[in-house]
C-alpha cells in the first residue's frame, strides 16, 4: 500500500467538520517524486488539500471538510496515473446524531406467555447503528433502592419492544425499568418506570355467548338481547370490571358502550335496542379495583333482537 488515510473521527455529528490526512510512503518509487494528492468524497473531487513533504520523505495531504452532510460516504485520496485516477486509500465516513431519549415506555404483563412486554418510541432517526437495551432491577420499595439486576433484554433489530421472561420477574414486587439507547455518538436513557408486573396485567377477554333459553324463563322483550359470557379461566380469580359495546350490523352507527359490568354478572339483558335488528356485540375487561390494562375486545357475537309484537292500536294505525 502506497497511501494511508487517517481521520479525526470516522463518525461525526451530521454537519460537523472532519479532518483527514493522506500519507504517501517514500518507497513508492514508481510514483512521481512530487505527486499531487487528490481528495474525493464519494464521486466528487474535493479541493482544499494542503500538501507537504515530511522530513522522512513521505508526502502528506491534509484536508478539512467543513460540513459532513452525508450520513454515509467514502473519502479517498488518489493520484493522477496516466489518464486515470489511482486510488491510494479510502475510509468510510458516517454522520448522524446521538440517540434521543427513548420516550413513551410502557409495559404490560401477559399471563399467557408469563412475560412482561415493554415497548417504547425510539425517537428520531439517528442515521447510525443504534442499539436499544431494556434494563431493569428488582426493588423492595419504590425503586429508590436497587435490588438484584435483571438480565438485559435486547430487542431484535429494528424492534422497539422486548419481553422479560417470568424467571426474571417477581410478581407483587416493584421493578425499575428503563431503556438505554447507544450509538457511536452517545448514550441516552428513558425516564425510569417503577411498577409491579401485576399492576400492568392485561387479561384475555371473556367469550360472549347467546343465553340458552330455559323453558321457565321469559323470552327477551322487543328491543332486548339476552347474552352471557364465559370468563377467561386463568384470570378468574382476578377481580375485574367489564364493558360491552354494541352496534347495528347495518348502517354506519358507531359503537355504543354499556358498563361497567362486574365480571361475575356472567349474563346480561341488554335493552333499549331497535327491534328486529341484527347487532354486533363485544366485551372487554380490566383488573379492578387494582390497576391493570384493558383486555382486547372479545371476538364479536352477532344477535338479533325480537320483533315488536303488534298491538291492537298499532294494527289500527296501519288502516
Amino acid at each position: 500500500e502506497c497511501g494511508h488515510i487517517s481521520v479525526s473521527a470516522p463518525i461525526v455529528h451530521l454537519g460537523d467538520p472532519i479532518t483527514a490526512s493522506c500519507i504517501i510512503k517514500q518507497n513508492c518509487s514508481h510514483l512521481d517524486p512530487e505527486p499531487q494528492i487528490l481528495w474525493r468524497l464519494g464521486a466528487e473531487l474535493q479541493p482544499g488539500g494542503r500538501q507537504q513533504r515530511l522530513s522522512d520523505g513521505t508526502q502528506e495531504s491534509i484536508i478539512t471538510l467543513p460540513h459532513l452532510n452525508h450520513t454515509q460516504a467514502f473519502l479517498s485520496c488518489a493520484l493522477n496515473w496516466g489518464n486515470s485516477l489511482q486510488i491510494l486509500d479510502q475510509v468510510e465516513l458516517r454522520a448522524g446524531y446521538p440517540p434521543a431519549i427513548p420516550h413513551n415506555l410502557s409495559c404490560l404483563m401477559n399471563l399467557t406467555t408469563s412475560s412482561l412486554i415493554c415497548q417504547w418510541e425510539p425517537g428520531p432517526e439517528t442515521h447510525l447503528p443504534t442499539s436499544f437495551t431494556l434494563k431493569s432491577f428488582k426493588s423492595r420499595g419504590n425503586c429508590q433502592t436497587q435490588g438484584d439486576s435483571i438480565l438485559d433484554c435486547v430487542p431484535k433489530d429494528g424492534q422497539s419492544h422486548c419481553s422479560i421472561p417470568r424467571k426474571h420477574l417477581l410478581l407483587y414486587q416493584n421493578m425499575g425499568i428503563w431503556v438505554q439507547a447507544e450509538n457511536a455518538l452517545g448514550t441516552s436513557m428513558s425516564p425510569q418506570l417503577c411498577l409491579d408486573p401485576m399492576d400492568v396485567v392485561k387479561l384475555e377477554p371473556p367469550m360472549l355467548r347467546t343465553m340458552d333459553p330455559s323453558p321457565e324463563a321469559a323470552p327477551p322483550q322487543a328491543g332486548c338481547l339476552q347474552l352471557s359470557w364465559e370468563p377467561w379461566q386463568p384470570g378468574l380469580h382476578i377481580n375485574q370490571k367489564c364493558e360491552l359495546r354494541h352496534k347495528p350490523q347495518r348502517g354506519e352507527a358507531s359503537w355504543a358502550l354499556v358498563g361497567p359490568l362486574p365480571l361475575e354478572a356472567l349474563q346480561y339483558e341488554l335493552c333499549g335496542l331497535l327491534p328486529a335488528t341484527a347487532y354486533t356485540l363485544q366485551i372487554r375487561c380490566i383488573r379492578w379495583p387494582l390497576p391493570g390494562h384493558w383486555s382486547d375486545w372479545s371476538p364479536s357475537l352477532e344477535l338479533r333482537t325480537t320483533e315488536r309484537a303488534p298491538t291492537h292500536h298499532h294494527h289500527h294505525h296501519h288502516h
Epitope: L111, T113, S114, R166, Q233, H237, I238
Partner: antibody, heavy 118, light 107 residues
Framework: EVQLLESGGGLVQPGGSLRLSCAAS????????MGWVRQAPGKGLEWVSS????????PYADSVKGRFTISRDNSKNTLYLQMNSLRAEDTAVYYC???????????WGQGTLVTVSS | DIQMTQSPSSLSASVGDRVTITCRAS??????LNWYQQKPGKAPKLLIY???NLQNGVPSRFSGSGSGTDFTLTISSLQPEDFATYYC?????????FGGGTKVEIK
C-alpha cells in the same frame, strides 16, 4: 395479620348434614375468592369448592357437586360450607383458604375435622 | 380436567442435599403452578406461586421452575425443618387439582 378460623366440624352419620364456618380477619374479605380444601386421613389434598368475591361464581369438585353448597357473608367476613348427604368418604380435615389472584391458596386455616360414621 | 402427577411419591435425603421434586400436568397450564409444604398435623403452607415466585418469608433455598406441562421444585440445601410433604397445584382452570404429594424423609 391474615387469620382464618374454621369451626363446625364433628361426628355425623352417613346421610346427615353439617355446616362449616370460616371466620376471616386481617384482610378485605369482600375482595377475595375463598375456597375449601380437604384432606382425608393419611391422604393428599383435595380441592372441594371455591367462591368468587361477591359469591356469584361457585365451582365444585365432581365428588361433592349437588351435595355441598359454598356461600359467604361479606358483612360478617365469614365463609360457609353446607354439607348434605354426607358419606364415609367425606371424612377429612376441612381447610378454608384465601385464594390469590392467580389461583394459589394462602393462607390456610388450621382445619376442622369432619367424621362421617355410623 | 387437568390432572397433576407428582414424582417421586417419597424420597430419603440428608441435611445439605439438593432435592428435586417434579410435577407434570396432563395438559399445558402456562405458569399456573403452585407449591405447598405440609408438616404432620399442620395446615399446608404456600412456598411458590405462578411456577417460580417465592412467597414472602420462604427461604431462598426453595425455588421453582418450568412452564407448560413440566415443573420442578428444588431445595438447594436441605435443612432439618424441610422434612415434610410437598404438593403441587394447578390453578389454570377449574376443577383445581393437587398432585399426590412427595414425602421428604430423613435418610
Amino acid at each position: 395479620e391474615v387469620q382464618l378460623l374454621e369451626s363446625g366440624g364433628g361426628l355425623v352419620q352417613p346421610g346427615g348434614s353439617l355446616r362449616l364456618s370460616c371466620a376471616a380477619s386481617g384482610f378485605t374479605f369482600s375482595l377475595y375468592w375463598m375456597g375449601w380444601v380437604r384432606q382425608a386421613p393419611g391422604k393428599g389434598l383435595e380441592w372441594v369448592s371455591s367462591i368468587s368475591s361477591s359469591g356469584g361464581v361457585t365451582p365444585y369438585a365432581d365428588s361433592v357437586k349437588g351435595r355441598f353448597t359454598i356461600s359467604r357473608d361479606n358483612s360478617k367476613n365469614t365463609l360457609y360450607l353446607q354439607m348434605n348427604s354426607l358419606r364415609a368418604e367425606d371424612t377429612a380435615v376441612y381447610y378454608c383458604a384465601k385464594l390469590g389472584e392467580l389461583g394459589w391458596f394462602d393462607p390456610w386455616g388450621q382445619g376442622t375435622l369432619v367424621t362421617v360414621s355410623s | 380436567d387437568i390432572q397433576m402427577t407428582q414424582s417421586p411419591s417419597s424420597l430419603s435425603a440428608s441435611v445439605g442435599d439438593r432435592v428435586t421434586i417434579t410435577c407434570r400436568a396432563s395438559q399445558g397450564i402456562s405458569s399456573y403452578l403452585n407449591w405447598y409444604q405440609q408438616k404432620p398435623g399442620k395446615a399446608p403452607k404456600l412456598l411458590i406461586y405462578y411456577a417460580s415466585n417465592l412467597q414472602n418469608g420462604v427461604p431462598s433455598r426453595f425455588s421453582g421452575s418450568g412452564s407448560g406441562t413440566d415443573f420442578t421444585l428444588t431445595i438447594s440445601s436441605l435443612q432439618p425443618e424441610d422434612f415434610a410433604t410437598y404438593y403441587c397445584q394447578q390453578s389454570f382452570m377449574y376443577p383445581l387439582y393437587f398432585g399426590g404429594g412427595t414425602k421428604v424423609e430423613i435418610k
